[in-house]
């Protein structure tokens, strides 16, 4: 999947753009908003009717090296009595993010952007019947 | 910089950290093997904490379009379709990495940016705030 070039419908390419080899892009790894913090409600993963656990995946050749994945704890949802209600489904909510991967080929190093799907949490949904055509 | 290990057999010509500026292949590798958008496309409607999706577009960013979730109700939807205000619909937020064109308008020059997105909503039991 190639990154779309800036279309002329938006604006002209400025003269000040740095020269970049064909098929590549220049990427500054100094992150904008590096210290931004998630301000989610406290402990929602355990208070949710579709609770989840977190698993940390670690890869030193990836940035960010730490990616946190959620897994729904139950197949059903937790009712007011604290029991699992299987007439409802706990389902994962997912979000795509970019990661930067460093690849070693002998002593040379190349960099590749990857799209990774992160499971962020779970939500409780009403199932539907599969209507056969 | 971003700390990355080096192949120990290679000459010590690079910093232990990621270089501040790197050249990256324009092709983005897609690792999403076990997802199927048709399955999750209607969770926003079927959830007990349903949400609306708002389009956030910025041509200076890749991806240029990001969808933001906003919970429809303060409470959660019961089986009878009514809202139960003894429970709370809350957004699930996630930090994601995007590319920001830098300098502005340049087609192939970017900087990494962290942004916070609301991905969906979940129904939670409220916490009682005990005053000390």
């Amino acid at each position: 999947r190639k990154i779309p070039k800036v279309g002329h419908t938006f604006f002209q390419k400025p003269e000040s753009c740095p020269p970049v080899p064909e098929g590549s892009m220049k990427l500054d790894t100094g992150i904008i908003n590096e210290n931004q913090r998630v301000s989610m409600s406290r402990n929602i993963e355990s208070r949710s009717t579709s609770p989840w656990n977190y698993t940390v995946t670690w890869d030193p050749n990836r940035y960010p090296s730490e990616v946190v994945q959620a897994q729904c704890k139950h197949l059903g949802c937790i009712n007011a009595q604290g029991k699992e209600d299987i007439s409802m489904n706990s389902v994962p909510i997912q979000q795509e993010t970019l990661v930067l991967r460093r690849k070693h080929q002998g002593c040379s190093v190349s960099f590749q952007l990857e799209k990774v799907l992160v499971t962020v949490g779970c939500t409780c949904v009403t199932p539907v019947v599969h209507h056969v055509q | 910089g971003i700390a990355i290990p080096r192949n120990s057999g290679c000459p010590n010509s690079e910093d232990k950290n990621f270089p501040r500026t790197v050249m990256v292949n324009l092709n983005i590798h897609n690792r999403n093997t076990s997802t199927n958008p048709k399955r999750s496309s209607d969770y926003y409607n079927r959830s007990t904490s349903p949400w609306n999706l708002h389009r956030n577009e910025d041509p200076e960013r890749y991806p240029s379009v990001i969808w933001e979730a906003k919970c429809r109700h303060l409470g959660c939807v019961k089986a009878d379709g009514n809202v139960d205000y003894h429970m709370n619909s809350v957004p699930i937020q996630q930090e994601i990495l995007v590319l920001r064109r830098e300098p502005r308008h340049c087609p192939n020059s970017f900087r990494l940016e962290k942004i916070l997105v609301s991905v969906g909503c979940t129904c939670v039991t409220p916490i009682v705030h005990h005053v000390a």
């Epitope: 489904n89 199932p127 539907v128 | -």
Partner: antibody, heavy 123, light 108 residues
Framework: EVQLVESGGGLVQPGRSLRLSCAAS????????MHWVRQAPGKGLEWVSG????????GYADSVKGRFTISRDNAKNSLYLQMNSLRAEDTALYYC????????????????WGRGTLVTVSS | EIVLTQSPATLSLSPGERATLSCRAS??????LAWYQQKPGQAPRLLIY???NRATGIPARFSGSGSGTDFTLTISSLEPEDFAVYYC??????????FGGGTKVEIK
């Protein structure tokens, strides 16, 4: 033709293992959650295990938890049940059943069944 | 665990008669109850789901009713092919898919 065909049953000694397979045809396999349901000779039905479309959701009956493992291979349109530490009370006809939930999710009703494969655990 | 009790264990009727089968749950399963038919040497077949919804291809003589703890499967006029064992099943609470012990409908 829409069908499920089980295989892999047979006579096995207590404590040993067996792997059941279910071949699905005539429908888009990964559009459905799948289950194993068993029936002891002359007895009623007992749900054993279920798995959603991408193996992200799996459940087991207490009677088999820790001994049986359900899995699926969507590329091969196949469902499996690995049965370890088999006991005499596992003797039954094992049915493969298709969940009627949409989007490969669980609905916990079974709209399509195979003919079953017989597992006999005896010394 | 929810226990489903079916009654009677055996129902002896003639073709053309009305059959009424009962399923009682040990606690409420709301409307999440299904009915299956099983003929000798065959796999079960789904008849009714969510207490009263007929599955695809099921004749109109089969109907289901009830909610909470008491449910009924009615066969308005028995056909020769309806003589079989009938099971109820809940999908309300864990463990899922618990079945009743069955009711055998036999020819009188």
């Amino acid at each position: 033709e829409v069908q499920l065909v089980e295989s892999g049953g047979g006579l096995v000694q207590p404590g040993r293992s067996l792997r059941l397979s279910c071949a699905a045809s005539g429908f888009t396999f990964d559009d459905y959650a799948m289950h194993w349901v068993r029936q002891a000779p002359g007895k009623g039905l007992e749900w054993v295990s279920g798995i959603n479309w991408n193996s992200g959701g799996i459940g087991y009956a207490d009677s088999v938890k820790g001994r049986f493992t359900i899995s699926r291979d969507n590329a091969k349109n196949s469902l499996y049940l690995q049965m370890n530490s088999l006991r005499a009370e596992d003797t039954a006809l094992y049915y493969c059943a298709r969940d009627m939930g949409g989007f490969g999710e669980f609905y916990w009703n079974f709209g399509l069944w195979g003919r079953g494969t017989l597992v006999t655990v005896s010394s | 665990e929810i226990v489903l009790t079916q009654s009677p264990a055996t129902l002896s009727l003639s073709p053309g008669e009305r059959a009424t089968l009962s399923c009682r749950a040990s606690q409420s399963v709301r409307s999440y109850l299904a009915w299956y038919q099983q003929k000798p040497g065959q796999a079960p077949r789904l008849l009714i789901y969510d207490a009263s919804n007929r599955a695809t291809g099921i004749p109109a003589r089969f109907s289901g009713s009830g909610s909470g703890t008491d449910f009924t499967l009615t066969i308005s006029s028995l056909e020769p092919e309806d003589f079989a064992v009938y099971y109820c099943q809940q999908r309300s609470n864990w463990p899922p898919a618990t079945f009743g012990g069955g009711t055998k409908v036999e020819i009188k």
